[in-house]
């Protein structure tokens, strides 16, 4: 097909000789083509397209990629001739860097539905060169890790040696989608979640007297986990006193948040203090009530069949521990004013002779 009508884009891949890195070309079909294939949804500048142009509609076919030999030979089908280049929907992925990737790459829809569609194509002139040794030593890696639950940032490798003030305007993409929120050479992440992982592309324009090039770099971002540096945090009970009715059953719940630990051995127990005595209570098994990638909330209850006068003189202590340290929360029972008649008190005193405590059993989940 005739490629003279294709829109043209010039890209530069300055690769690091010290690390493995990938490169991506998007089939960014042009506007204002009116054809079926080149249709762009009409978005205002403040709106962000869900995908790059053309790639979003389910009914549109994938694109075909070609490489144009420098000697004027016919276009080559990339899938047949270049095993290190992978066609993935509307993107072209270069798995290995090297100057042999320099050349012109053409993309167009696989199926042509009208004569106008012939010109619906993009020619990308890609220049590939090793990064000059003059580049700074601490340039950002093409593989960057973000620690879950913490703050972090993703730096554009080709601009990481420049200050934010010097940096040109940058266009970022994540997994092929335009990120309109930032134009700087760094994406700042206030709190890292698993959805932050993916393939990021950063583009900026470099101009000389003759022409203008888009300098592009690709960053693979992983979200990683690490052991907490905090001891567990007791969420409940919050208050150190609890109003109760004598002779009535009572459940006191202890809920604690445990930060992530690769080897997770949480300890959660109830014990009772009575004057100079202190003993651990046999209570139902702890159970996980909420588990996320960065922490887990565990609950363990102490159950009294009926509250006695003696219980009012005792302190109930929830003790939680991880490999970093322990936390405790004490609860003192206090009789509700105006509650409980003589019968209730009589019943409560009878129970003091037995001190029977009944428990339920729960399954305990952990990381």
């Amino acid at each position: 097909f005739n490629i003279s009508g294709c829109s043209t884009k010039k890209l530069l891949w300055a690769y690091s000789t010290r690390s493995e890195e990938e490169f991506i070309l998007f089939c960014d079909l042009p506007e204002p083509q009116k054809s079926h294939f080149c249709h762009r949804s009409q978005l205002s500048p403040t709106q962000v397209p869900d995908h790059l142009p053309f790639t979003d509609s389910k009914d549109l076919p994938d694109v075909q990629w070609y490489r144009q030999p420098s000697n004027g030979d016919p276009l080559e089908d990339i899938r047949k001739s270049y095993p290190h280049i992978i066609q993935d929907k509307c993107t072209l992925r270069f798995l290995t860097p090297g100057v042999n990737n320099t050349g012109s790459y053409i993309c167009r829809p696989k199926m042509i539905k009208s004569p106008y569609d012939v010109a619906c194509c993009v020619k990308m002139i890609l220049e590939v060169k090793p990064q000059s040794n003059a580049s700074c030593e601490n340039s950002a890696s093409h593989k960057q890790d973000l620690l879950l639950g913490s703050t972090g940032s993703i730096s554009c490798p080709s601009l990481s040696c420049q200050s934010d003030a010097q940096s040109p305007e940058v266009t970022w993409y994540k997994n092929g989608k335009l990120l309109s929120m930032t134009r700087s050479n760094r994406i700042v992440v206030d709190e890292v979640y698993i959805y932050h992982q993916g393939t990021y592309v950063c583009d900026y324009t470099q101009s000389d007297t003759a022409s203008s090039w888009t300098v592009r770099a690709v960053v693979q971002v992983r979200t990683i986990v690490g052991d907490t540096k905090l001891k567990p945090d007791i969420l409940d009970p919050v208050e150190s006193t609890l109003e109760v009715e004598l002779g009535k059953p009572l459940t006191i719940s202890c809920k604690a948040r445990f930060g992530f630990e690769r080897v997770f051995n949480p300890v959660m127990k109830w014990y009772i203090k009575d004057a100079d005595l202190e003993w651990e209570v046999s209570v139902p098994e702890a159970k996980s009530i909420k588990s996320t990638l960065k922490d887990e909330i565990i609950e363990r209850n102490i159950i009294l069949e009926k509250v006695t006068q003696r219980d009012l003189r005792r302190t109930f202590v929830c003790f939680v521990q991880n490999s970093i340290g322990n936390t405790t929360q004490s609860v003192q029972l206090k009789e509700k004013r105006g509650s409980g008649g003589l019968n209730d008190i009589f019943e409560a005193q009878k129970i003091e002779w037995h001190e029977t405590v009944r428990f339920q059993s729960h399954h305990h989940h952990h990381h």
Epitope: S141, I194, T223, V225, D227, E261, R262
Partner: antibody, heavy 124, light 107 residues
């Protein structure tokens, strides 16, 4: 660009303590786990243990009584000490970055960056 | 400790061949398995995690599959640089363990 380099004596006498250090360059020791692995001549790989940069450790039970792994974040280094060595401890010792990758509500741990290894011979 | 058994222990193949290496765990390990490649005198190189997720920069001719107790590493079309020893590794429970290795040689 993260690189690991093991250092330490290549020859240790029986019953003595083997001491190795791994220096991390081109990146921070923070946020990662760091493992030691060994490979006896002509044999497979054996995991010795790991340390998180904050100091949490986990050791292979078969070596636990003899192993200590420590970390010095200010020097970007972590170390291995193996006491009461015998000829059976002769091996190539590797240090590796041990990363926990979060993926779809779970975690997967891999040793994604390795040192080139250092040979330690236990002999009198 | 969970034992990983690789088969075969050694394998001869030619450039362009399709090769499959198997790793069997002594108990279920979900998808908590990684594959490594080691060349003589060199450190192991990480290829695959989560049983089937390819590390970026690893050629797409490598693929992993399996879950539970049975796993495979497949090289779709052997290249000269692929001749090496391959190890599987589980991290489902401690201690972390490796398979005994599969040596892939040129026929």
């Amino acid at each position: 660009q993260v690189q690991l380099q093991e250092s330490g004596p290549g020859l240790v006498k029986p019953s003595e303590t083997l001491s190795l250090t791994c220096t991390v360059s081109g990146g921070s020791i923070n946020n990662y786990y760091w493992s030691w692995i060994r490979q006896p001549p002509g044999k497979g790989l054996e995991w010795i243990g790991y340390i998180f940069y904050s100091g949490t450790t986990n050791y292979n039970p078969s070596l636990k009584s003899r192993v200590t792994i420590s970390v010095d974040t200010s020097k970007n280094q972590f170390s291995l000490k193996l006491s009461s060595v015998t000829a059976a401890d002769t091996a190539v010792y590797y240090c590796a970055r041990d990363v926990g990758i979060a993926a779809r509500n779970s975690y997967y741990y891999v040793m994604d960056v390795w040192g080139q290894g250092t040979t330690v011979t236990v002999s009198s | 400790a969970i034992q990983l058994t690789q088969s075969p222990s050694s394998l001869s193949a030619s450039v362009g061949d399709r090769v499959t290496i198997t790793c069997r765990a002594s108990q279920g390990i979900s998808s908590a398995l990684a594959w490594y490649q080691q060349k003589p005198g060199k450190a192991p190189k990480f290829l695959i995690y989560e049983a089937s997720s390819l590390e970026s920069g690893v050629p797409s001719r490598f693929s992993g599959s399996g879950s539970g107790t049975d796993f495979t590493l497949t090289i779709s079309s052997l290249q000269p640089e692929d001749f090496a020893t391959y190890y599987c590794q589980q991290f489902n429970s401690y201690p972390i363990t490796f398979g005994q290795g599969t040596r892939l040689e040129i026929k």
